[in-house]
Interface confidence: low
């Protein structure tokens, strides 16, 4: 009796452990049986066709390769799809930047919040803040709140984010604190 390929599934061949950015990765499209035996494979990610081999190989995987993959196996009787298989790529914090709210120019006496933004998997677990002299500041959360902000707070700041894979740092961002009209009037 002839039938379409059965029990199609995606299997990770390598690495044996979790996938880190830069790893060589191989996925295999497996099926239990097919009659007739002549088959064709299709690989797809998020709706985009990638290849027609039984294996899908990445020489050096990147975070952009993460996503939902599936394969189909075809024979002359029909086409059978695997369940979607999620490829997760772990990587150190990257694209770090310091954003400032309400902006990078704030009047003294108000509040300013500096946020260390990043892209990381797993998410950043530890933040370190530094000033323009590369002095570490006693803040270890994603947000650094200055209230009331003083003119002496003017300067450049940067942050470092750390996760289980590694660490990354942001470029410098400059905060300018200007005198209030009251202070100027007293002078």
């Amino acid at each position: 009796v002839q039938y379409a390929p059965r029990d199609v599934r995606v299997r990770k061949i390598k690495p044996l452990s979790e996938i880190h950015s830069g790893n060589s990765v191989s996925l295999q499209c497996d099926f239990s049986s097919s009659h007739p035996k002549e088959v064709q494979f299709f690989w797809e990610k998020n709706g985009r066709l990638l290849g027609k081999e039984s294996q899908l190989n990445f020489d050096s995987i990147s975070p952009e390769d993460a996503g939902s993959y599936s394969c189909w196996v075809n024979n002359s009787i029909g086409q059978t799809a695997s369940k979607a298989w999620t490829l997760e790529v772990l990587y150190a914090p990257r694209r770090l930047r310091v954003s400032m709210s309400p902006g990078d120019q704030v009047m003294e006496g108000k509040s300013a919040t500096l946020t260390c933004e990043s892209d990381a998997n797993p998410p950043v677990s530890h933040y370190t803040w530094f000033d323009w002299n590369n002095q570490s500041l006693p803040y270890h959360s994603q947000k650094l709140r200055l209230e009331p902000v003083k003119v002496q707070h003017s300067g450049a700041y940067w942050c470092q984010g750390t996760n289980s894979v590694g660490k990354g740092r942001s470029p410098l961002s400059t905060l300018t604190v200007y005198y209030s009209p009251e202070t100027i009037g007293r002078r």
Partner: nanobody, 118 residues
Framework: QVQLVESGGGLVQAGGSLRLSCSAS????????MGWHRQAPGKQRELVAS?????????KYADSGKGRFLISRDNNKNILFLEMNSLKPEDTADYYC??????????WGRGTQVTVSS
């Protein structure tokens, strides 16, 4: 080279029906497996139904379409059909025709849009 053109998509109310067609031209004598796939916005492309070219024309359906969808073909005119009944909003997607030839090359159509309103 096989060229595929889908038609029959459109806007339909929930519970309604549509009949999609996929017309093949080119070296159609070599086609041995035909299927309909669909892709909803932001979702994975998925197999809806497939049919073999052999005399039996063995058919296969995804669970989502069993009992509601019917795949068929007219070998003389090289047309593949998908009859869709009792449509649901979750059937909203672009529907694509895939044909696989005896040398196991594959050809896709450009798709036809199906929108099911509630």
């Amino acid at each position: 080279q096989v060229q595929l053109v889908e038609s029959g998509g459109g806007l339909v109310q929930a519970g309604g029906s549509l009949r999609l067609s996929c017309s093949a031209s080119g070296i159609t004598s070599s086609i041995n497996s035909m299927g309909w796939h669909r892709q909803a916005p932001g979702k994975q492309r998925e197999l809806v139904a497939s049919i073999g070219r052999g005399g039996s024309g063995s058919t296969k359906y995804a669970d989502s379409g069993k009992g509601r969808f019917l795949i068929s073909r007219d070998n003389n005119k090289n047309i593949l059909f998908l009859e869709m009944n009792s449509l649901k909003p979750e059937d909203t997607a672009d529907y694509y025709c895939l044909e696989v030839t005896t040398d196991l090359s594959s050809y896709w159509g450009r798709g036809t849009q199906v929108t099911v309103s509630s």
